[in-house]
């Protein structure tokens, strides 16, 4: 399963902690939400130059 | 595949309202951000501002307090309503969806062009 | 609000040549979290924009490769390496970092020489 993206303590926090699993970081609002609410598919690469398809052990967004 | 359509009408009048409807198919827009952006003749982008999955808003403030985003979720639309407009408020009309991995705009309805004059 | 300047604002080429345009942010565009939100569109005539690159240098699906991003920082371009007919149109950088607002570069203007 895909853990969600980084969280932030502070809109200036230099180390994000990561938002537990199932919630992914919302970048407008600055906090973690369900990862549902966000349409946050996975990525489909469309060449080299593209992303992997995401493991548990791959930095979030 | 989630398909967006604006409508509402091409042309409208100096000092009235501009208000514009997003259709919004194969996705619902109680999930995610949906946005609306204008293209200015001359090519300019001017992002105006979102509703989200909660129902929340943001305004450019560029606009100032012209501008209202609202939404029908047993519909499945969501609108865009600019007051006072003049002639600087020529734009092709964009409603567009937002992913929320990457934050780039995936998904874009066809444009509706809004002439204001009288 | 960050503002995106874009340059060159036409770029007439020969059909097969390489194609450059460049994008500046006036603020980094590295996020806290370590990723930079850069992305590039293309609007052909008549139609919306569609999205060609995100997070400054990964393909969308169905972009071909001969369209490559690169850049950091607050310095990005983008590069077509041989054009084909079906590259013309204008080209927008955009950036996710700083919002809202989201912003967008002034476009290039990519056409037959």
């Known amino acids: 399963m895909r853990r969600g993206p980084r969280s932030l303590r502070g809109r200036d926090a230099p180390a994000p902690t990561p938002c537990v699993p199932a919630e992914c970081f919302d970048l407008l609002v600055r906090h973690c939400v369900a990862c549902g609410l966000l349409r946050a598919p996975r990525p489909k690469p469309a060449g080299a130059s593209s992303p992997a398809p995401r493991t548990a052990l791959q930095p979030q967004e | 595949d989630v398909q967006l359509q604006e409508s509402g009408p091409s042309l409208v009048k100096p000092s009235q309202t501009l208000s514009l409807t997003c259709s919004v198919t194969?996705?619902?827009?109680?999930?995610?951000?949906w946005n609306w952006i204008r293209k200015f003749p001359g090519n300019k982008l001017e992002y105006m501002g979102y509703?989200?999955?909660?129902?929340?808003?943001y305004y450019n403030p560029s606009l100032k307090s012209r501008i209202s985003i609202t939404r029908d979720t047993s519909k499945n639309q969501f609108y865009l309503q600019l007051l006072s407009v003049t002639t600087e408020d020529t734009a092709t009309y964009y409603c567009?969806?937002?992913?929320?991995?990457?934050?780039?705009?995936?998904?874009w309805g066809a444009g509706t062009l809004v002439t204001v004059s009288s | 609000d960050i503002v995106m300047t874009q340059t060159p604002l036409s770029l007439p080429v020969s059909l097969g040549d390489q194609a450059s345009i460049s994008c500046r942010s006036s603020?980094?565009?590295?996020?806290?979290?370590?990723?930079?939100?850069l992305h590039w569109y293309l609007q052909k005539p008549g139609q919306s924009p569609k999205l060609l690159i995100y997070?400054?240098?990964n393909r969308f699906s169905g972009v071909p490769d001969r369209f490559s991003g690169s850049g950091s920082g607050t310095d990005f371009t983008l590069k077509i390496s041989r054009v084909e007919a079906e590259d013309l149109g204008v080209y927008f950088c955009?950036?996710?970092?700083?919002?809202?607002?989201?912003?967008f570069g002034s476009g290039t203007k990519l056409e037959i020489k």
């Open positions: 567009a969806g937002l992913d929320g991995l990457y934050w780039y705009f995936d998904v």
């Open positions: 194969g996705d619902s827009i109680t999930s995610g951000y």
């Open positions: 509703i989200s999955y909660s129902g929340s808003t």
């Open positions: 603020q980094s565009l590295v996020h806290s979290n370590g990723n930079t939100y």
């Open positions: 997070k400054v240098s």
């Open positions: 955009s950036q996710s970092t700083h919002v809202p607002p989201f912003t």
